[in-house]
């Protein structure tokens, strides 16, 4: 999906008012310096592409983020503010249902959510120069 035509300010507002705290709660008990940010993004569409990938695509060691509350809210926000997103995701969801995993919090998942927090921070500050 091409995130170019999303309403970025509406997504930012949704993140600040409904998603950010759930990411923090998921990470509770871990130090903010525990994980290095290794995933970056260059602009808002790119950030959303990376956020979508890290949130919904199972990875080695962390197969369960898609069923977390922050993921559900992310899915809902993208569907509302990214034209055509819901249509493109319907087929993908049917495939996902066949391999849905039980929610398990692993160290790898914590690292992945830490990366997500960094991507969201970058999304919210689009005018900053890339480090």
């Amino acid at each position: 999906y091409d995130f170019t035509n999303c309403d970025f300010e509406k997504i930012k507002a949704a993140y600040l008012s409904t998603i950010s705290k759930d990411l923090i709660t998921y990470m509770s008990g871990t130090k903010s310096t525990e994980f290095n940010n290794t995933v970056s993004c260059s602009n808002r569409p790119h950030c959303l592409t990376e956020i979508q990938s890290l949130t919904f695509n199972p990875t080695a060691g962390c197969a369960s983020l898609a069923k977390e509350m922050f993921a559900m809210k992310t899915k809902a926000a993208l569907a509302i503010w990214c034209p055509g997103y819901s249509e493109t995701q319907i087929n993908a969801t049917q495939a996902m249902k066949k391999r849905r995993k039980r929610k398990v919090t692993t160290n790898k998942c914590l690292e992945q959510v830490s990366q997500l927090q960094g991507l969201w921070r970058r999304f919210n500050r689009p005018l900053l120069k890339q480090q």
Partner: antibody, heavy 117, light 107 residues
Framework: QVQLVESGGGLVQPGGSLRLSCAAS????????MSWVRQAPGKGLEWVSG???????YYAGSVKGRFTISRDNSKNTLYLQMNSLRAEDTAVYYC???????????WGQGTLVTVSS | DIELTQPPSVSVAPGQTARISCGGD??????VYWYQQKPGQAPVLVIY???KRPSGIPERFSGSNSGNTATLTISGTQAEDEADYYC??????????FGGGTKLTVL
Amino acid sequence: QVQLVESGGGLVQPGGSLRLSCAASGFTFSSYYMSWVRQAPGKGLEWVSGIFFDGETYYAGSVKGRFTISRDNSKNTLYLQMNSLRAEDTAVYYCARQQYFDHIDIWGQGTLVTVSS
Amino acid sequence: DIELTQPPSVSVAPGQTARISCGGDSLGGKYVYWYQQKPGQAPVLVIYGDSKRPSGIPERFSGSNSGNTATLTISGTQAEDEADYYCQSYTNALSTVFGGGTKLTVL
């Protein structure tokens, strides 16, 4: 303007079935997470069920296995199929738009379901 | 999973400040929303994201949430604020949960 209009409520005997409908207008229905919330007479609000744009569903424990939520995005309509109805299911049923799988920003006017012999 | 506890009733004199509490285990780690419901009407969202007001909701409505308690505050309460108020949050099992409701009486 944004509107949700429920229909299908009425009197039904215990063990019976009923299907509620909710017609949505004024917004892109196919993009939103939608829910049903009920309120027994003189009681508080109880969330019943919700459904994503892609058909992914969630249920309260009290109705799981008896109620089925569905949607027809081409008709901008939300449904609630209620089977094996009990007296405690008597309530006003509200159709609701649940913003971001989160808070309810739009409510219908409600439809009364009475389960009694 | 989380249960939300509200006082059944709160009374306030016109022009005074009304505070309605909503308690739940580690509630501060979740978002809380507040609804106003008047007799015979559907509920109306008055606070979302702990403390944000939807457009059209008067400034006298405010919210906070920390620890195990969320609070809806109505400053300079008016007669028209008399209603039932419900808090709402969510569970780890991805379901929506409401408090039992608080009847606000403006004396």
